[in-house]
Interface confidence: low
């Protein structure tokens, strides 16, 4: 409790005491009768009047003083209240600012944690990629140091799958040019020998016309690596191959390609489609993975 508030309570008590004094009980009756007889009565009356006057003056003076004190206290209290309200408002504002700052700090911390997590993930990916590249490069080095007859790993940027390496073009060439490109890479246009391989290639090329290593430019359908066509896997579209001549480009359709749904179609070999190169890994066992 503040000192001003204690004083205020004391003032109230004092006021109460003075009220009780003004309303005091009358003197006993037999004594009054005794005093009211003769000159003593006058003297007593004067004395009492004088006493009463003194009392009144004292009380008036004290009351005036008390009123002044009360006014001062009220003013002080009013100022204190205003000051307190201002301080409370100030504290409230500061509290709001602190809250906002806290939220901002929390948000920043959260973002930094997220950034750190992303950096960590990115770093892990880079490390994995680095290890993969390192393994690939060490394998390339081994291949270069060897007599070149054995390939135990895929070239850089080629995808390994089931003991074969695949390279997926992003540009288009005529079938013969695509075939030549693969040969220059010591590979051949992709030869599809199973449903599983079909699905793998299809996943990587997407819904895009893409040449494969199958043609019938010499009559029978023929895989470029010598795999027997007649006994092998086939995935033609219905009614294909049809060796269609209606395209008006001269000649029939002698080269096979993956269509947008993965099934095969025969088409004019001059069309500039994307292509897939394939090369087989040697049977020699691979090095154990570094990770």
């Amino acid at each position: 409790m503040t000192k001003e508030y204690q004083d205020l309570q004391h003032l109230d008590n004092e006021e109460s005491d003075h009220h009780q004094l003004r309303k005091g009980p009358p003197p006993p009756q037999p004594l009054l009768q005794r005093l009211c007889s003769g000159p003593r009565l006058l003297l007593l009356s004067l004395g009492l009047s004088l006493l009463l006057l003194v009392v009144v003056c004292v009380i008036g003076s004290q009351n005036s003083q008390l009123q002044e004190e009360l006014r001062g206290l009220r003013e002080t209290f009013s100022n204190f209240t205003a000051s307190t309200e201002a301080q409370v408002k100030g504290l409230s504002t500061q509290g709001g600012n602190v809250g906002r700052k806290m939220k901002s700090l929390e948000s920043q911390l959260e973002k930094q944690q997220k950034d750190l997590s992303e950096d960590h993930s990115s770093l892990l990916l880079h490390v994995k990629q680095f290890v993969s590249d390192l393994r690939s490069l060490s394998c390339q080095m081994a291949a270069l140091q060897g007599n070149g007859s054995e390939r135990t790993c895929c070239p850089v940027n080629w995808v390994e799958h089931e003991r074969s390496c695949y390279w997926f073009s992003r540009s288009g060439k005529a079938w013969a040019d695509a075939d030549n490109y693969c040969r220059l890479e010591d590979a051949h246009l992709v030869v599809v020998t199973s449903w599983e391989e079909q699905k793998f290639v299809q996943h990587h090329i997407g819904p895009v016309n893409t040449w494969m290593g199958l043609h019938d430019q010499n009559g029978p359908w023929k895989w470029v690596d010598g795999t027997d066509y007649e006994t092998g896997f086939k995935n033609w579209r219905p009614e294909q191959p049809d060796d269609w001549y209606g395209h008006g480009l001269g000649g029939g359709e002698d080269c096979a390609h993956f269509t947008d749904d993965g099934r095969w179609n025969d088409d004019v070999c001059q069309r500039p489609y994307r292509w897939v190169c394939e090369t087989e890994l040697d049977k020699a066992s691979q090095e154990p993975p570094l990770l």
Epitope: D216, Q217, N218, G219, K222, E230, T231, G232, G250, G251
Partner: antibody, heavy 118, light 106 residues
Amino acid sequence: QVQLVESGGGVVQPGRSLRLSCAASGFTFSSYAMHWVRQAPGKGLEWVAVIWYDGSNKYYADSVKGRFTIARDNSKNTLYLQMNSLRAEDTAVYYCARDPGSYGFDPWGQGTLVTVSS
Amino acid sequence: SYELTQPLSVSVALGQTARITCGGNNIGRRNVHWYQQKPGQAPILVIYRDRDRPSGIPERFSGSNSGNTATLTISRAQAGDEADYFCQVWDSSTAVFGGGTKLTVL
């Protein structure tokens, strides 16, 4: 209509040469692979050779490899079979046939008889 | 090299169904073509890719292929169907013919 007509057959001595021709009409000759198939008297059919539509690739049966040469002249719509070092076992009717993709041989010419005899 | 085996001859009563077989190792995995050759004439394609018929060939001619045997079926056989029949497949870049079957319509 599609038509194939062979010519150039005849009697020839062993070790000598002969050139067969096959004139094509009724279709775009330069768009099709072409074959030679032979049939010895009273025997079955034997495939001899194939040439791609543009002449860029040729394949032969083992029995004639190194002795026979398949060729074509697309400007003349004509298929050829140059036969060298002929043997008695080469005696047969020689047919030329068109190959429309993976549909078998269709059609065939009427054939020309080659007889290798001394 | 790949070999195709055909029966030398098959007989069928007029109007009945004739079946000519062509045997080969896993032939069901290959496309089989059938040719008809009448005496003194060039062969003509009657069935290609196991079961397809070229235009102009009657519906009476049908084909099937599975396992180690391909079959040419001629229903309601007619006298005009009497001929030699050859099956054919591709083995790498080489065409291989069966020995041929002589169909006799009784």
